[in-house]
Structure formats: C-alpha cells, structure tokens
C-alpha cells in the first residue's frame, strides 16, 4: 500500500503540474513597429511580436492582429501604449492631440464588438518643446470564452513609440470559470 | 484502505497547500524616502522598504536596491510611481520636464540589463500653479530566471513623491515555466 | 487497488478543482453613473454595479459602496478612474485641476482608514480645447483579511466617465497567507 | 470647393519687408495647418514655413528662421507670412498650400494656391 | 535634413509609353511618408500620390507609386499627351519637409 500511495502521490504530482500549466494560457505581445499605421484617426493594430524579445504566447493564439482565446477562464488583460514625438519626425499639424487606447472582445460566434478598458488623455504638444512623451496604461480582470479575440485601437498611430518595453499588451488566466 | 486513503487525501492536502505557498512568489516594496538621490538625471533607485508598511517579501531577495528573482517562472510586475512639487520647495530648474520610469532586469550570469517596462510623460509645471503632480503606472507579465533581478529606474528623482502609496514596485508569481 | 487509486484521484481531482475555485475570489466594479456626486471636492464613490456588462463578483462582497474582503490572502487590486469634460457640459470653474484617485483599505475590526495606492495628475484644462480627457491606472498587491473593506475616493467626481469601459476597480485572489 | 489666393507680392530691395496673405474659402480654415513654399525661378519647390490650425505652433526652414514670421486670423481665414531683411536668395514664386489634416505630422501640401512673385532687387 | 535625388533629370517619351521615375532618400523615410506632385509650366503643383503608394483624389489609375525605405517610385503606365510636366517627390517623415529636384517628362 505504501508503494500504492508514493504512485498515488508521484503520479498526483505529474498531473497537478501538468493540468496547472495547461490551465494558464497567458500572452505578453510588443508592437511590430515595421507596421504602425499613419494618420491621426482611430485604428486597430494588427502587426505584434509573440516570439521575440519580450513577446512571448502560451495556450492563446495570436492571428490577423488579434489575441485568440482558446481557453474559458477569468483573465487579467493589460495594455502599455506609448506615445512619442520628436521635432526631428516631422511638424505637428496640430498642438490638441487625444492620445488614446481601447482594449476590446470581439465576440465570433454572436459577431460584436466591446470595449473593456479604455484609457488615455488629451495633451497639448506645442512645437516649442523638441520632444514630447506621454504613456497609458490599463488593466482588469475579464471573463473570457474560447473563441473570443482580444485587440488594440489607438488613436494618432503615428506617434507610437516602436521599443518593445513601451508599446505592448497582454493577457494571463487567474482562474476557471465556475 | 478507507484509512490510507484519508491519509493519502491529508498528506496530499498539506503538500498541495505547502507545494502551493511555496511557487508563489512575491514582493511590493515601497520607497525609502530618507534615502531618495537629488538631481533631474535618470537614476536607479536603490532604497525600498520590504518589511513595513504595505511593503512585503516572500520567496525573493531584496538586496543592494535590487528585487532578485529566486525562483524560475512567469511573473506579474508593476510599478506605480510618483512625482509631486509644491511652491514652497522652491522654483524648479526647468518647467519643461520629463518624468518617467524604467522597469529593468539585470542577468548576472551573462551581465546584461535591458528594460521591460517604460512608462512617463513630458510635462509642462509652469509657475503659474503652486502645486503639480502626475503619477505613472506600468505593469507586465515576464519571464524571470532565479538570479536574475529587477530594479526601477527614474528621471528627476528630487520630485518623487516619498509616501508608500505613491511610489511602489512589485512582482508576483503567476505560473511556472513549462 | 487500482480501483481505490482512481478514486483517489477522482476525489482529487473534484477537491483540488472546488478548492481552487473556493480559494480565488474576485471583483471587478464599473461604476454607476446615475449617483455620482457633483463637485470638485475629494469623495468616496459608492455606486458601483457587480452584476451588469463587465461587473462581477465572487467569494466577496459589495455593500455600501465598499468591497468586502471575505476570505483572508494576498490580492492584486486596480483602479482605472476616466475624468472627461466637454464645453457643451458648461464652462469649468477652474482651469487648474487636480485629478486623482485614491484606493483606500478599511478595517472594522481595529476601526483605521489606511491608503493603499494613489495616482493622477494636475491638469491644466484651457478653455482653448473643446474637449478633455484623462485617466489613472493603479495596481498593486496587498495582504487582505476577511472583514476589511476596500473603496475608492476620487477628486473631481463630477467629471468622472461614466463607461464600464473608463471607470472601474477590482481584486482578485492571488494566494493564502502563510 | 477648397481655394487659397495669395496676394501681397512685388519689388522690393534687399534689407526690406514684405507681408504676404493667403486668402483661404471652401474649408474650416481653423481646423487645418497651412504652410507657405516657394519657387526660385526655374528651380525646385522649397517649403519655408509651417503653422498649426489654431497657430500656437510655428515651424521654419532654416533659410528664414528669424527673418520671417507666419500667422494666421481664423476669423479672418487668412494666412500670412512676414518677410523681413530680405535677401535675394528669397527672390521666388510663394505659394500657400493646405496639409490634408488627415495625419497628426504636417505632411503633404493639396491644394496649393497659384502662387505670388516675390523679386528682391536693387 | 533628409535630400531626395530624382532620377533622371528629363526623360523624353512619347505618348503611350510607360514612365518610371526614381526618387532616392539620402536616410531611411520614416513610415513611407512619400508624395508626388506634377508640376506644369505657369502652375501650382499637384498632388497625385501620398503615403507612396496612395492615389490622391481625382488622380487616374494610370498613375501609381510604390517603395518604401529610401527608394520610391512613380510610375506612368500609358503616358498621356497632359502628362508631361515636371515631377517633384517630397518626404515628410522627418523635419524639415523636403523636395526633390524634380524630372522633367518631356515629348520625345
């Protein structure tokens, strides 16, 4: 019995690790700065790194620039967005910027769109300052079903800092659905 | 075998807590105020409180201004960083201002340091107002090797604002590396 | 004893998976907009929804506009607070604001109100721009036990966004106390 | 439809000043940058100066940087560009032109007005 | 300051021809914030193309752009007799905005 129980045990062990790493999907995803949209409107980001540096996905997919999930669970998603200008990029059109970012869930099966968490500010950059900076950050704790997809809307794409520890977001499951 | 069993369902309850406590890491360490450097320069910040107040330890190292990873794994990171001035600290060398903060590990074995995080913004404090203040967030989930260590780095660290709910740092453990 | 084993395992693996549940509470609170003081001064918010669009609650409580600790551990706890103005809302009786958030622990026991987290800006809000808009994100982790409360007190109340997507808290679970 | 008409041009001898007006219709004027660019004859296009729609920004080539100076009067729609201590390196054809407003950097110039001579001589 | 260098100088062809027309950036264009414009004798230029490769409104398909980096170029598919101008490329990834010297597309 005591051999039957170290089994037990041993065998226990094997699949509790198991069956913990297979339940947190997480992903940590860093903006392809080779693709940033231009312009001053709202746009989706679709170009992130899930491989290199930082960037990095686990039990998720990432697919045509959004964040797949493919595990029901209770999530803790987060952004960093990073905007920059320097007088060497080129005049600013406009001193009033709204400097913004929307995390949204984009429902496949019942085809809708939600924002999560939305954050951001409106500055005044004037052309008597070289360099200007600002950062958002945001996040929360969400309910998340398989199929469900995850992006990134920002305004004035064009002012994106490109750096991988400036312009990222990502996801990692906490805990099961009931 | 009804006994075994229980004692099997026991020592198993005891070592799942215990196993569980144990791959749990974390750390939220808070500003040592008596110990902020002078200057507008980017500094690292070496003087953290781990045992007082709101700041803790478990399972990581605290040492020479460094938060040191003990064990392998998937970490949550976060910073929250303060920056304040008020009239009657007198006049601020420049208005024109960048405050941010650095979020940045440091591999002994191959010495190397690279920033994970960076969040901040140029601000203008002009004169007209008595009092300014602007805090920044940053939050990621990493990858961290025992031995490795995370240190946070700011500009015009004079203007830190020294509560212990306004500049913190911490890390929590999320999961285990496959 | 095979068949002894699977049980075993089966008891197990329902114990280990209702444990798990049981031991991770959570909240997420959006704000409700339809009670949200007027004015300018520092207030405690607390109309909040738990159980519509992103709102949710498990293993705590929401009473009195405060989040109820119901099972000891250590928590990870966010604040995202959106403060917006727009000329048609009526001019601004200052232009010079300061725009914060503080994320406050009560506890009945040993009667105290002690700061957590904090976080905003001073903003200078011209009647220049037709529109404004900033937000604050805090987070941080923190030892809880059953019975303290957590709430939010903010500046500005009257310029509080009032989307599920811009103005919200929350906690969840990350481990026991030793 | 968008129309920008430059006037203000003329003779003038080096050391002088002239003022240059862009008369703007068919837009919100406030709501988008204008630059001015000019065109020595016979040569290339070069862009002299730049103001943001609600003029708290201006931006300069440095050939004019403190001797010209752009403005602008939203309630006017109207655009103007101050020369002063003339040269005749600054003999050209001054065109006023519209940025698209469609990207936060100022950017390309549609449409351009038809232009005003400018001729520093002795 | 980033200088742009259009290739060649002039380029004699008739019309129906096919024109290609080189612009060359002496540093990288951030973003492919490239324009073209056609200037003719006695006129304001024109707008056809931005972000290198994007046809302004009113312009024919006949005329397109392409590049990225610190090569572009414009291309006439047929020309046109209305065609021949001068060509002017002009960046504005970087400060301050910049002109080529322009290509001269002239009747063979």
């Known amino acids: 019995i005591r051999a039957e129980k170290a089994m037990v045990d041993g065998s226990w062990l094997d699949l509790a690790k198991r069956s913990k790493l297979e339940a947190q999907p997480f992903a940590h995803l860093t903006i392809n700065a080779t693709d940033i949209p231009s312009g001053s409107h709202k746009v989706s980001l679709s170009s992130w790194y899930h491989d290199r540096g930082w960037g990095k996905i686990s039990n998720m997919t990432f697919s045509n620039g959004k964040l797949i999930v493919n595990q029901d669970g209770f999530y803790y998603l987060y952004a960093n967005i990073c905007f920059r200008h320097h007088e060497t990029s080129g005049d600013l059109a406009t001193e009033y910027l709204q400097l913004m970012v929307y995390v949204t869930k984009t429902s496949i099966k019942i085809p809708s769109s939600h924002t999560l968490m939305k954050g951001g500010s409106t500055k005044y950059w004037s052309g008597n300052s070289e360099f200007h900076f600002y950062s958002i950050n945001v996040g929360g704790f969400f309910k998340l079903r398989s199929g469900e997809e995850i992006s990134i809307e920002v305004s004035n794409p064009s002012l994106l800092d490109p750096d991988q520890d400036a312009t990222y977001f990502g996801a990692f499951k906490v805990r099961d659905i009931d | 075998i009804r006994a075994e069993k229980a004692m099997v369902d026991g020592s198993w309850l005891d070592l799942a807590k215990r196993s569980k406590l144990e791959a749990q890491p974390f750390a939220h360490l808070t500003i040592n105020a008596t110990d902020i450097p002078s200057g507008s320069h980017k500094v690292s910040l070496s003087s953290w409180y781990h045992d007082r107040g709101w700041g803790k330890i478990s399972n990581m190292t605290f040492s020479n201004g460094k938060l040191i990873v003990n064990q392998d794994g998937f970490y949550y990171l976060y910073a929250n960083i303060c920056f304040r001035h008020h009239e009657t600290s007198g006049d601020l060398a420049t208005e024109y201002l960048q405050l941010m903060v650095y979020v940045t590990k440091t591999s002994i074995k191959i010495p190397s340091s690279h920033t994970l995080m960076k969040g901040g913004s140029t601000k203008y404090w002009s004169g007209n107002s008595e009092f300014h203040f602007y805090s920044i967030n940053v939050g990621g989930f990493f990858k961290l090797r025992s031995g490795e260590e995370i240190s946070i780095e700011v500009s015009n660290p004079s203007l830190l604002d020294p509560d212990q709910d306004a500049t913190y740092f911490g890390a929590f453990k999320v999961r285990d590396i496959d | 004893i095979r068949a002894e084993k699977a049980m075993v395992d089966g008891s197990w693996l329902d114990l280990a998976k209702r444990s798990k549940l049981e031991a991770q509470p959570f909240a997420h609170l959006t704000i409700n907009a339809t009670d949200i003081p007027s004015g300018s001064h520092k207030v405690s918010l607390s109309s909040w929804y738990h159980d519509r669009g992103w709102g949710k609650i498990s293993n705590m409580t929401f009473s009195n506009g405060k989040l109820i600790v119901n099972q000891d551990g250590f928590y990870y706890l966010y604040a995202n607070i959106c403060f917006r103005h727009h000329e048609t809302s009526g001019d601004l009786a200052t232009e010079y604001l300061q725009l914060m958030v503080y994320v406050t622990k009560t506890s009945i026991k040993i009667p105290s109100s002690h700061t957590l987290m904090k976080g905003g800006s001073t903003k200078y809000w011209s009647g220049n721009s037709e529109f404004h808009f900033y937000s604050i994100n805090v987070g941080g982790f923190f030892k809880l036990r059953s019975g303290e409360e957590i709430s939010i007190e903010v500046s500005n109340p009257s310029l509080l966004d009032p989307d599920q997507d811009a103005t919200y808290f929350g906690a969840f679970k990350v481990r026991d106390i030793d | 439809e968008v129309q920008l008409l430059e006037s203000g041009g003329g003779l003038v001898q080096p050391g002088g000043s002239l003022r240059l007006s862009c008369a703007a219709s068919?837009?919100?004027?406030?709501?988008?940058?204008m630059s001015w660019v000019r065109q020595a004859p016979g040569k290339g296009l070069e862009w002299v100066s730049g103001?943001?729609?609600?003029?708290?920004?201006?931006y300069y080539a440095d050939s004019v940087k403190g001797r010209f100076t752009i403005s602008r009067d939203n309630s006017k729609n109207t655009l103007y560009l101050q020369m002063n201590s003339l040269r005749a390196e600054d003999t050209a054809v001054y065109y006023c032109?519209?940025?698209?407003?469609?990207?936060?950097?100022?950017?390309?110039?549609?449409?351009w007005g038809q232009g005003t001579l400018v001729t520093v001589s002795s | 300051e980033i200088v742009l260098t259009q290739s060649p100088g002039t380029l004699s062809l008739s019309p129906g021809e096919r024109a290609t027309l080189s612009c060359r950036a002496s540093?990288?264009?951030?973003?492919?914030?490239l324009a073209w414009y056609q200037q003719k004798p006695g006129q304001a230029p024109r707008l056809l193309i931005y972000?290198?490769?994007s046809r302004a409104t009113g312009i024919p398909d006949r005329f397109s752009g392409s590049g990225s980096g610190t090569d572009f170029t414009l291309t006439i598919s047929r020309l046109e007799p209305e065609d021949f101008a001068v060509f002017y490329c002009?960046?504005?990834?970087?400060?301050?905005?910049?002109f080529g010297q322009g290509t001269k597309v002239e009747i063979k």
């Open positions: 032109a519209k940025d698209p407003g469609t990207t936060v950097i100022m950017s390309w110039f549609d449409p």
């Open positions: 068919g837009f919100t004027f406030s709501s988008y940058a």
């Open positions: 103001i943001t729609g609600s003029g708290g920004s201006t």
């Open positions: 540093q990288s264009v951030r973003g492919r914030y």
């Open positions: 972000g290198a490769s």
């Open positions: 002009q960046q504005y990834g970087s400060s301050p905005r910049t």
